[in-house]
């Protein structure tokens, strides 16, 4: 009968930081130079041997004289309680098929981690433990005095535990959160009655969970170095250097090379000139608690991220064309580059693609003259597109060309004894049509009654008007814009010898917030178009003069501009243009985009004061310069009488007082006789004009006292 192979020389050591027990033992009576498969059963008790908290089997092959090792991690800090360990064995080898039986247990080995030294009455464990967010942690206190009441707090909130023995209580903290990088505080307080006997605290370091690196990618710009980048995610560093930031290591499996990266989100890898084309990289993120890794497999030629092009230049630049040239960094022989050009100018963007070998060239056509363009280029590997290089760009300006459109010209003709005064206006050409900087305008005045006679006036830009004094002949006026290259087409206008149509009546119109809606009767005969001009009624025409060209088949238009101001009257004139370019005044209109109430009240004189009447007059009041069409006047009268005078009606003023009111509906009626008055009586009056928007400003009443019947004024 075989001897049971009992485990002997059991020694147990501890690692407080890891909260682990490390067992070492040997097996006696093992045949010399023989190997046996064996099973060891291990029992672990806590506080007392009868309190078994863990039983497990460990299978291994045992050699003669071999020292066996096995470790166990405790969820409870080892300082919290005494542990006991014992072991027994069983041969489980095919060489011994007969029934096997367990050996005797080894004797109990007591394990006590004494950190409860000194005169302190309370201890809390574990010390400075590092765990990952979301894990479960067990802590405990050891109290010397069982009479003490002990309360424990996590971040100031009381926690409740399970008593392991009269001196020890354990607390299971489930799924601990990350609170701060300098740790989570836990303390316990021992007290008797209301008196604190002492407090002990620990710091639990909770690390954020190490994330798998995201967006891991590698590329080369020169086939010498691979530049690898990734998003590291959350930094898991803790305070006091308890855990540094996670480290990153690159491992390439084909070459077996490894590199510890010095940056948290990128790493360079030297490409060896041994024609390795395929790379299999593993990026390993690591902190004290765990490792995370990601893999990429790629062909080097498929990961080319070119340096940006250089030496961007423009050749043969004229008004509408240019040749763009650039260079690329040569990285391999017979390499084909795909380049993309972007052209920005005049608020537009054009894109072109071109395939090149070493030097790039592209013909840019249909450009606008005298325009600044920004052209930029980027390139990529044409064979295996990975990504574009950065842009390289340069600005260039096309040359000027002659202006392409005639200026928009209009005029005001005023008749003076023996001549016409013609004020000529033109609008600056748009950038699109000026094709450069307009330097001057040529105004050619030709007398149509004396064809050989013409005058040239050269007017420097940026002037946009000129005054011509002409006799009573017909004139053709041409206006031409000039830049450094040449002249625009001419704008032609004809001034007739006949005076303008004076018979045209002025019509009042009402504007809206959107502007003025105008319509007119078509001009008899052939017209090439209509012109509507307008200006501020009260100002010098030259200051605010505008015009609009309207097509020949249109007899209405809306004049809308932000320049129209409330309370300002605008005068409009509508002209028909004959085929001979002679303008004929068709209609005149005047109005406000928005009427306002009058801005002032008339200065009123009291005339012919008698014992029974007086006359009010305001002849000097101008109805023209008002912020609305004056429709009439309101005359307010106050007296002691209960009844209002004939033609007056009762009214209530804004202050709530009562008075009598008379309405005059004719804006030109600027006098009123107030009669049927009593002698030696006190009256007050106030006169205010009104428009469609309301009355003038409120003002003080003027006092009048009628004389007695015998007085003569």
């Amino acid at each position: 009968e075989r001897l049971p192979l009992t485990p002997v020389s059991l020694k147990v050591s501890t690692n407080s930081t890891r909260q682990s027990l490390h067992l070492q033992w040997t097996v006696h009576n093992l045949p010399y130079h023989q190997e046996l498969k064996m099973v060891f059963q291990i029992q672990i008790s806590r506080i007392e041997t009868s309190n078994v908290i863990w039983v497990g089997n460990y299978s291994t092959t045992v050699k003669w004289n071999q020292v066996l090792h096995w470790s166990w991690e405790s969820e409870l800090p080892l300082e919290c309680a005494t542990h006991f360990v014992r072991i027994k064995s069983l041969v489980d080898d095919a060489k011994f098929p007969e029934p096997n039986f367990w050996s005797n247990w080894s004797s109990w080995e007591e394990v006590s981690v004494q950190d409860s030294t000194g005169q302190d009455i309370l201890f809390v464990f574990p010390k400075d433990k590092l765990v990952e967010e979301g894990t479960n942690v067990t802590i405990c206190y050891v109290s010397r005095n069982i009479q003490n009441n002990v309360s424990c707090y996590l971040e100031g909130k009381q926690i409740h535990g399970e008593q392991l023995d009269p001196h020890v209580t354990a607390f299971n903290l489930n799924s601990v959160p990350f609170i701060r990088n300098k740790g989570t505080n836990i303390y316990c307080e021992a007290s008797q009655g209301n008196v604190s006997e002492g407090m002990k605290g620990i710091v639990l370091f909770v690390s954020k969970v190490l994330e798998e690196p995201k967006d891991f990618s590698c590329e080369t710009e020169d086939f010498k170095t691979l530049h690898c980048t990734w998003d590291p995610g959350t930094d898991t560093a803790l305070g006091w250097s308890k855990q540094p930031s996670q480290s990153y290591t690159l491992f390439e499996s084909f070459s077996g090379e490894k590199k510890l990266c010095t940056h948290k989100n990128w790493c360079n890898w030297q490409i060896t000139q041994d024609s390795q084309e395929t790379y299999n990289f593993t990026l390993i993120a690591e902190n004290y608690l765990r490792k995370r890794s990601v893999n990429i497999l790629f062909n080097l030629t498929h990961r080319v991220y070119l340096m940006n092009p250089f030496s961007v230049n423009f050749e043969n630049v004229n008004a509408t064309n240019a040749i763009m040239t650039w260079k690329v960094h040569s990285i391999r022989n017979n390499f084909t580059y795909l380049c993309q050009i972007e052209l920005h100018g005049e608020g537009k963007m054009m894109q072109y693609n071109v395939s090149i070998k070493v030097n790039g060239e592209y013909f840019l056509s249909e450009l606008e003259p005298a325009t600044e363009y920004m052209a930029r280029v980027r390139c990529a590997d044409a064979s295996h597109f990975w990504k574009w290089s950065e842009w390289s760009g340069q600005n260039f300006t096309t040359l000027e060309a002659a202006p392409s459109e005639a200026p928009d010209v209009w005029r005001i003709v005023s008749l003076e004894p023996g001549n016409h005064t013609v004020t000529l206006f033109w609008k600056p050409l748009s950038k699109l049509h000026a094709n450069g900087k307009i330097l001057f305008y040529n105004v050619v005045v030709e007398n149509l009654d004396k064809p050989s006679s013409s005058e040239l006036h050269s007017i420097p830009a940026p002037a946009n008007s000129t005054k011509l004094i002409l006799d009573r002949c017909s004139y053709q006026i041409c206006v031409i814009a000039n830049n450094s290259v040449g002249a625009s087409p001419a704008s032609v206008i004809v001034i007739s010898a006949d005076p303008e149509n004076k018979e045209v009546e002025e019509e009042r119109i009402a504007g809206t917030e959107g502007g003025f809606s105008l319509s007119w009767k078509p001009q008899p005969g052939d017209v090439i178009g209509y012109v509507v001009d307008w200006c501020d009624h009260t100002q010098d025409v030259l200051g605010d003069f505008q015009w609009k060209n309207v097509g020949p088949n249109t007899t209405s238009t809306v004049i809308s501009t932000d320049a129209f101001r409330p309370g300002v009257r605008y005068d409009f004139r509508i002209y028909g243009l004959s085929t001979k370019r002679i303008a004929c005044l068709l209609e005149k209109k005047t109005g406000y985009s928005q009427e306002l109430a009058p801005s002032d009240n008339p200065h009123v004189l009291v005339d012919t004061l008698t014992s029974h009447s007086f006359t009010l007059s305001w002849k000097d009041y101008s109805t023209e310069s008002q912020p609305g069409f004056i429709q009439g006047y309101h005359v307010y009268l106050k007296s002691k009488a209960r009844q209002c005078h004939p033609r007056f009606e009762k009214a209530v003023l804004s202050d709530g007082s009562e008075c009598c009111k008379y309405k005059i509906d004719n804006p030109e009626e600027k006098a009123l006789i107030v009669d049927n008055l009593k002698p030696e009586s006190f009256y007050e009056f106030f006169i205010t004009p009104f428009t469609s928007a309301g009355e003038g400003p409120s003002a003080t009443f003027t006092k009048v006292t009628t004389p007695d019947e015998h007085s003569s004024m």
Epitope: F123, K127, G156, I179, R180, N185, G201, I202
Partner: antibody, heavy 126, light 110 residues
């Protein structure tokens, strides 16, 4: 009984350094963290930093980094604070104060300061 | 300028109840415990309240503390003339990595 006794008043010139001591008695010196707090005349309290007498670990308020050093001599249960490059605004009463929790840690956590020294007046004047 | 905000002064008559507030932010009062100190004229500060509402032995139960969100308060009931002193709140600040104090409240017993 538990007490902290500080060194006497100091008068220093601008640019000089000052070293204040704080002797602990009545408890295990290495079991409790020491804080340093100062108070200018008529002003509030200002935390300067902390030291773990057991490990010697320290942490200073950002404002004083580079100018302050906290040390200890376990054999005589004494903590020290040294402040260099003194300026007139460093004129204050300097207190050492014990953290109320005996921490089983080499690191810092503030709970409350239950024992204070009597204070040391430091005057910085040219 | 103190990180924690306290009213500069407070007053009450003997027997009355007074409250002193202490306002902070999520990085200090909002996420850490608050303590209160009493400083009698010419003396070192004395701990009155720790962990928001707990009293060290020897502190009368007339003193009580509370915390809600990013604010804390100290209440003194049955005010006595010997309570005339400066009161300071304090907390750990996770952003500043240190202890921060309130500017102090001078309590006058009328």
């Amino acid at each position: 009984q538990v007490q902290l006794v500080q060194s006497g008043a100091e008068v220093k010139k601008p640019g000089a350094s000052v070293k204040v001591s704080c002797k602990a008695s009545g408890y295990t010196f290495t079991s409790y963290d020491i804080n340093w707090v100062r108070q200018a005349t008529g002003q509030g309290l200002e935390w300067m930093g902390w030291m773990n007498p057991n490990s010697g670990n320290t942490d200073y308020a950002q404002k004083f980094q580079g100018r302050v050093t906290m040390t200890r001599d376990i054999s005589i249960s004494t903590a020290y604070i040294e402040l260099s490059s003194l300026r007139s605004e460093d004129t204050a009463v300097y207190y050492c104060a014990r953290d109320m929790v005996a921490a089983n840690t080499d690191y810092y956590f503030y709970y409350g300061m239950d024992v204070w020294g009597q204070g040391t007046t430091v005057t910085v004047s040219s | 300028q103190s990180v924690l905000t306290q009213p500069p002064s407070a007053s009450g008559t003997p027997g009355q109840r007074v409250t002193i507030s202490c306002s902070g932010s999520s990085s200090n009062v909002g996420s850490n415990t608050v303590s209160w100190y009493q400083q009698l004229p010419g003396t070192a500060p004395k701990l009155l309240i720790y962990t928001n509402n707990r009293r060290p032995s020897g502190v009368p139960d007339r003193f009580s503390g509370s915390k809600s969100g990013t604010s804390a308060s100290l209440a003194i009931s049955g005010l006595q003339s010997e309570d005339e002193a400066d009161y300071f709140c304090a907390a750990l600040d996770d952003s500043l990595n240190g202890v921060v104090f309130g500017g102090g409240t001078k309590l006058t017993v009328l």
